[in-house]
Amino acid sequence: SPEVWVQVQMEATNLSSFSVHCGVLGYSLISLVTVSCEGFVDAGRTKLAVLHPEFGTQQWAPARQAHWETPNSVSVTLTMGQSKARSSLANTTFCCEFVTFPHGSRVACRDLHRSDPGLSAPTPALNLQAD
C-alpha cells in the first residue's frame, strides 16, 4: 500500500517564501494530487494547488507555483508578507492528498507547530487512509 510523505522547507534567505514537498512511496498510478492547508488563512481548509498528471496544475494564493518534482512527488511554493508568515505558520497544517489507482485516496499532513524552527526536519507525516 502506498505511503504519502510531506515536508516543508523554508528558504534560508527569504523567510516569506517556503515550499511544501510531498510524494508517494510505492507502486501506484497517480491520477490527482491536491495540496491544502488548515489554520493558515482561517479555521477551514484552504486548497493551495491541484496537480493533474496530464492536464497540468492550478494554484491559488498564497501558492505561487506548483509543479511535479518527480513522477511521484510535487512541490508547492508559497509567498506572503514576512510578518504574516511568522504569525500564521505557527498554527498551520499542510496536507497532501494523492488519488491513486488501485489504492484510492491517501492523505498525509504535516503539523508545523510540532516541527523544529527550521521547518525542514524529516519528521514522520501523519498518514490518514481513506479508500
Epitope: Q7, Y27, G56, W68, E69, P71
Partner: antibody, heavy 123, light 106 residues
Framework: QVQLVQSGAEVKKPGSSVKVSCKAS????????ISWVRQAPGQGLEWMGG????????NYAQKFQGRVTITADESTSTAYMELSSLRSEDTAVYYC????????????????WGQGTLVTVSS | DIQMTQSPSSLSASVGDRVTITCRAS??????LNWYQQKPGKAPKLLIY???SLQSGVPSRFSGSGSGTDFTLTISSLQPEDFATYYC????????FGGGTKVEIK
C-alpha cells in the same frame, strides 16, 4: 549543465556489499531525483530505484526491494547506492541518472547519466 | 509491474534505410514513454521523451509516436552513427525499460 561523476570500479566477494557513489556538479542537486540503473554484461537496462534528495525518500523496483539502499547527502551533492548480499549475477555496470522533467506535467526521463561503475562479483 | 516489450530484439539495416522499432506496454501508460540510444561502453543517451518530443541536439531523422500501449521509434534515413542499441522506458508507474533493439549493419 548538471554532470554526474561516479566512483571507480569495484571487485567484491559473493555475500558482501558494495556502495557506489554519484556526485553531481553544475546544478541544484536537491531539485531532482537521482535514479540508479544497472546493466549486466550483454544485457539490457534495469531500473533499481531512485531517491529525492530534498526529503531523503526513495522508491525501489520490486526486484531489488530489501537488498538495495539508496541514500543522498545534500551537503556533498552525492547520491549512493548500496547493494547487499552480492551474487555473481550482480556483476554489472551501475549507472546513476538524473530524473528530468518539465514540471507542469508528470513526464520525466533520465538525463544526464553518470559514466557508469563496473561492479564485479567473483570468489 | 509494467512490462515493456520491444521488437525486434535485433535488426540488420543499411545506411539510408528507414528503420522502425516498436515498444508495447503491458498496460496503458498514456504518453509516458522515452527512447534512449546506447553505444558499446557508453551510457545511454536520451533521444525522445513523452513519446514524441525530440530531445535537444538529437537529429530530426529520429521521431517517436504512439500512446496507450503501442509506441514506435522511427529513424527516417539510417546514418553510420546510428548503429547502436535502442531502449524504450515507461515513466508512468515508477520506471521500466524494454529489452532493447540492436541495430546492426547489413
Amino acid at each position: 549543465q548538471v554532470q554526474l561523476v561516479q566512483s571507480g570500479a569495484e571487485v567484491k566477494k559473493p555475500g558482501s556489499s558494495v556502495k557506489v557513489s554519484c556526485k553531481a556538479s553544475g546544478g541544484t542537486f536537491s531539485s531532482a531525483a537521482i535514479s540508479w540503473v544497472r546493466q549486466a554484461p550483454g544485457q539490457g537496462l534495469e531500473w533499481m530505484g531512485g531517491i529525492f534528495p530534498i526529503s531523503g525518500h526513495a522508491n525501489y523496483a520490486q526486484k531489488f526491494q530489501g537488498r538495495v539502499t539508496i541514500t543522498a547527502d545534500e551537503s556533498t551533492s552525492t547520491a549512493y547506492m548500496e547493494l547487499s548480499s552480492l551474487r555473481s549475477e550482480d556483476t554489472a555496470v551501475y549507472y546513476c541518472a538524473r530524473d528530468t522533467g518539465r514540471g507542469y506535467t508528470r513526464h520525466f526521463w533520465f538525463d544526464p547519466w553518470g559514466q557508469g561503475t563496473l561492479v564485479t562479483v567473483s570468489s | 509491474d509494467i512490462q515493456m516489450t520491444q521488437s525486434p530484439s535485433s535488426l540488420s539495416a543499411s545506411v539510408g534505410d528507414r528503420v522502425t522499432i516498436t515498444c508495447r506496454a503491458s498496460q496503458s501508460i498514456s504518453s509516458y514513454l522515452n527512447w534512449y540510444q546506447q553505444k558499446p561502453g557508453k551510457a545511454p543517451k536520451l533521444l525522445i521523451y513523452a513519446a514524441s518530443s525530440l530531445q535537444s541536439g538529437v537529429p530530426s531523422r529520429f521521431s517517436g509516436s504512439g500512446s496507450g500501449t503501442d509506441f514506435t521509434l522511427t529513424i527516417s534515413s539510417l546514418q553510420p552513427e546510428d548503429f547502436a542499441t535502442y531502449y524504450c522506458q515507461q515513466s508512468d508507474i515508477l520506471y521500466t525499460f524494454g529489452g532493447g533493439t540492436k541495430v546492426e549493419i547489413k
